[in-house]
């Protein structure tokens, strides 16, 4: 059973390492894949002394942990590299960090990407 599934056909693309990887730095990435597989968008970033540095954004292969996520939100507490994935076109355009501890109340740190 799949409720309210949104198709992902394209994602915001960004690569901080674009020169070395020989890719574009930014743009829109069409998401390709097998017909029977779902596609997602993702974002990875770092927080260097309070400054947000985007590492990569783009398409992400079929991954059950991305199912039913309409927003790109990292919820892990204090990761080295922040990661989020989501379903829906360009859903990785905005991403945010809402750490959730097991017991304590979640706090929020919304992020506006500035590639």
């Amino acid at each position: 059973a799949i409720l309210g599934r949104s198709e992902t056909q394209e994602c915001l693309f960004f690569n901080a390492n674009w020169e070395k990887d020989r890719t574009n730095q930014t743009g829109v990435e069409p998401c390709y894949g097998d017909k029977d597989k779902r596609r997602h968008c993702f974002a990875t970033w770092k927080n260097i002394s309070g400054s947000i540095e985007i590492v990569k954004q783009g398409c992400w292969l079929d991954d059950i942990n991305c199912y039913d996520r309409t927003d790109c939100v990292e919820k892990k507490d204090s990761p080295e590299v922040y990661f989020c994935c989501c379903e829906g076109n360009m859903c990785n355009e905005k991403f945010s960090y809402f750490p959730e501890m097991e017991v304590t109340q979640p706090t929020s740190n919304p992020v506006t990407p500035k590639p």
């Epitope: 059973a1 029977d36 079929d62 942990n65 039913d68 892990k76 097991e102």
Partner: antibody, heavy 118, light 111 residues
């Protein structure tokens, strides 16, 4: 420390029902997909069911479709497997597993034994 | 119906190297199937060894490595030890909510 503790197994007659539970601790349960995997006596591992973070998407192996229902209660950090119309071939140890990004099983419970016999 | 195939059994001498493989009937295994490998000793829950083709799980010794060999996923154990004697399972993520386990390989460490 991540812990997954299954319960609810036991002896049941063919055609009967059981509900398995998996109590999760040591991680933020609502952030991860979960799965059930079983192992019949002397046999290999078999994926049974999976469920997305919200519970909005559920998946089953063909042999249990229409008989088993997976669900989760994110407020109670608990995964469930409702098993109806049980058959002898459902006899197995049932493991719950946490699923990490790239869809692999990163932590496993110790399992609970379900025996279907008259 | 997807069937994932593994060698039913394999033997290795202590200190030797063994490569277990994982293929399927519908074509080639690629990294997009996120192959993962699990070790299980009798009466115990499985232990995660390798995920995403070649990433070792936390605490797994570097004697264990994963790769794609030709059209199959592979688990290589170098410098095999007595306590590597176990069952090894590969899993392929087929996407759209479906996983398929291989039948498992029973590894015997001789001697």
């Amino acid at each position: 420390e991540v812990q997954l503790l299954e319960s609810g197994g036991g002896l049941v007659q063919p055609g009967g029902s059981l509900r398995l539970s998996c109590a999760a601790s040591g991680f933020t349960f609502r952030n991860y997909a979960m799965a059930w995997v079983r192992q019949a006596p002397g046999k290999g591992l078999e994926w049974v069911s999976g469920i997305s973070v919200t519970g909005g998407s559920t998946f089953y192996t063909d042999s249990v479709k229409g008989r088993f229902t997976v669900s989760r209660d994110n407020s109670r950090n608990t995964l469930y497997l409702q098993m109806n119309s049980l058959r002898a071939e459902d006899t197995a140890v049932y493991y719950c597993a946490k699923v990490y990004y790239t869809s692999f099983f990163d932590y496993w419970g110790q399992g609970t034994l379900v025996t279907v016999s008259s | 119906q997807t069937v994932v195939t593994q060698e039913p059994s394999f033997s290795v001498s202590p200190g030797g190297t063994v490569t277990l493989t994982c293929g399927f009937n519908s074509g080639s295994v690629s990294t997009s199937y996120y192959p993962s490998w699990y070790q299980q000793t009798p009466g115990q829950a499985p232990r995660t060894l390798i995920y995403n083709t070649n990433t070792r799980s936390s605490g797994v010794p570097d004697r264990f490595s994963g790769s794609i060999l030709g059209n199959k996923a592979a688990l290589t154990i170098t410098g095999a030890q007595a306590d590597d004697e176990s069952d090894y399972y590969c899993v392929l993520w087929m996407g759209s909510g479906i996983w398929v386990f291989g039948g498992g390989t029973k590894l015997t460490v001789l001697g």
